[in-house]
Amino acid sequence: NKILVKQSPMLVAYDNAVNLSCKYSYNLFSREFRASLHKGLDSAVEVCVVYGNYSQQLQVYSKTGFNCDGKLGNESVTFYLQNLYVNQTDIYFCKIEVMYPPPYLDNEKSNGTIIHVKGKHLCPSPLFPGPSKP
């Protein structure tokens, strides 16, 4: 028995930040679980982890240097990533493990979300146009 995960196929991070919502076919209310976000086709980089516990505040952390936060819904976890770099444009996969109460459950691998990080470009301001042609 596996949990199904739905993610947006693509998101664009315009201000080097993005909200990625992982929607599960499972209600996380009063469960102990570990939700995580992984970067790359091989999911090699664990970007962010959210630990949920029935009795404690949500624990959110990254061991790989990402600036992340997490928000819990009944059947979803939303990862808020900030300070992303253009070279962090990649595919990101949601993962969920429900530990307690038993039985242990995890998810079928999702299709992932391509996060396209748009760099902050200095655009010419309309108040200070460039030199006009004669």
Epitope: E32, R34, E97, M99, P101, P102, P103, Y104, D106
Partner: antibody
Framework: EVQLVESGGGLVQPGGSLRLSCAAS??????????VSWIRQAPGKGLEWIGE???????YYSPSLKSRVTISRDNSKNTLYLQLNSLRAEDTAVYYC????????????WGQGTLVTVSS | DIQLTQSPSSLSASVGDRVTITCRAS??????????LHWYQQKPGKAPKLLIY???SLQSGVPSRFSGSGSGTDFTLTISSLQPEDFATYYC?????????FGQGTKVEIK
């Protein structure tokens, strides 16, 4: 046949660290459906759960020991490890590894245990 | 944490006696109609051995004189006819929530 064999026990100085091994046979530590826990028993006392590792490699620890404990594994050796730091006399115990199935989480197979004595 | 309280802490019985040990949890350990409460037997110098899982399911290879019952917070281990090899310490354990916890044990001694 499922078997768990612990090793690495002995005399350790207070403040030191221990690293115990649990060699598994008859099943794979990375196969979905089973996990392994570490449990300890102080001389003449009851059983205390330390933590566990799932087939995925995710770990879960007892809050009272979380700051001092690390559970890891080597899939190529099908071996589980327990690292416990900043040892004190109260950590003197027999340390067991025990397997559980995801269905009920009951510990269906146990190792023979390894004794750790913390003393100067 | 879920506290498990066993009673009695020790008991003296004779071969052939019916023995009952109770385990009370500080909160329900039931989920979707299943009780995550297990019973183990431990003999001196040996590792514990699983007898009963999920409150009432007999572990493979365990004699049928052992049985378990109960749900919610109150559970019972019964040995219908005590045998010489049954003199040991018995523990209940919950796996409903982490940290997993054990009862303090019940020592069954020869009268």
């Amino acid at each position: 046949e499922v078997q768990l064999v612990e090793s690495g026990g002995g005399l350790v100085q207070p403040g030191g660290s221990l690293r115990l091994s649990c060699a598994a046979s008859g099943f794979s530590l990375s196969t979905s459906g089973v996990g392994v826990s570490w449990i300890r028993q102080a001389p003449g006392k009851g059983l205390e759960w330390i933590g566990e590792i799932y087939h995925s490699g995710s770990t879960y620890y007892s809050p009272s020991l979380k700051s001092r404990v690390t559970i890891s594994r080597d899939n190529s050796k099908n071996t589980l490890y327990l690292q416990l730091n900043s040892l004190r006399a109260e950590d003197t115990a027999v340390y067991y590894c025990a397997r559980y199935e995801y269905y009920s989480y009951a510990f269906d197979y146990w190792g023979q245990g390894t004794l750790v004595t913390v003393s100067s | 944490d879920i506290q498990l309280t066993q009673s009695p802490s020790s008991l003296s019985a004779s071969v052939g006696d019916r023995v009952t040990i109770t385990c009370r949890a500080s909160q329900s350990v039931d989920f979707h109609g299943k009780s995550f409460l297990h019973w183990y037997q431990q003999k001196p110098g040996k590792a514990p051995k699983l007898l009963i899982y999920a409150a009432s399911s007999l572990q493979s290879g365990v004699p049928s004189r052992f049985s378990g019952s109960g749900s919610g917070t109150d559970f019972t281990l019964t040995i219908s006819s005590l045998q010489p090899e049954d003199f040991a310490t018995y523990y209940c354990q919950q796996s409903y929530r982490s940290p997993r916890t054990f009862g303090q044990g019940t020592k069954v001694e020869i009268k």
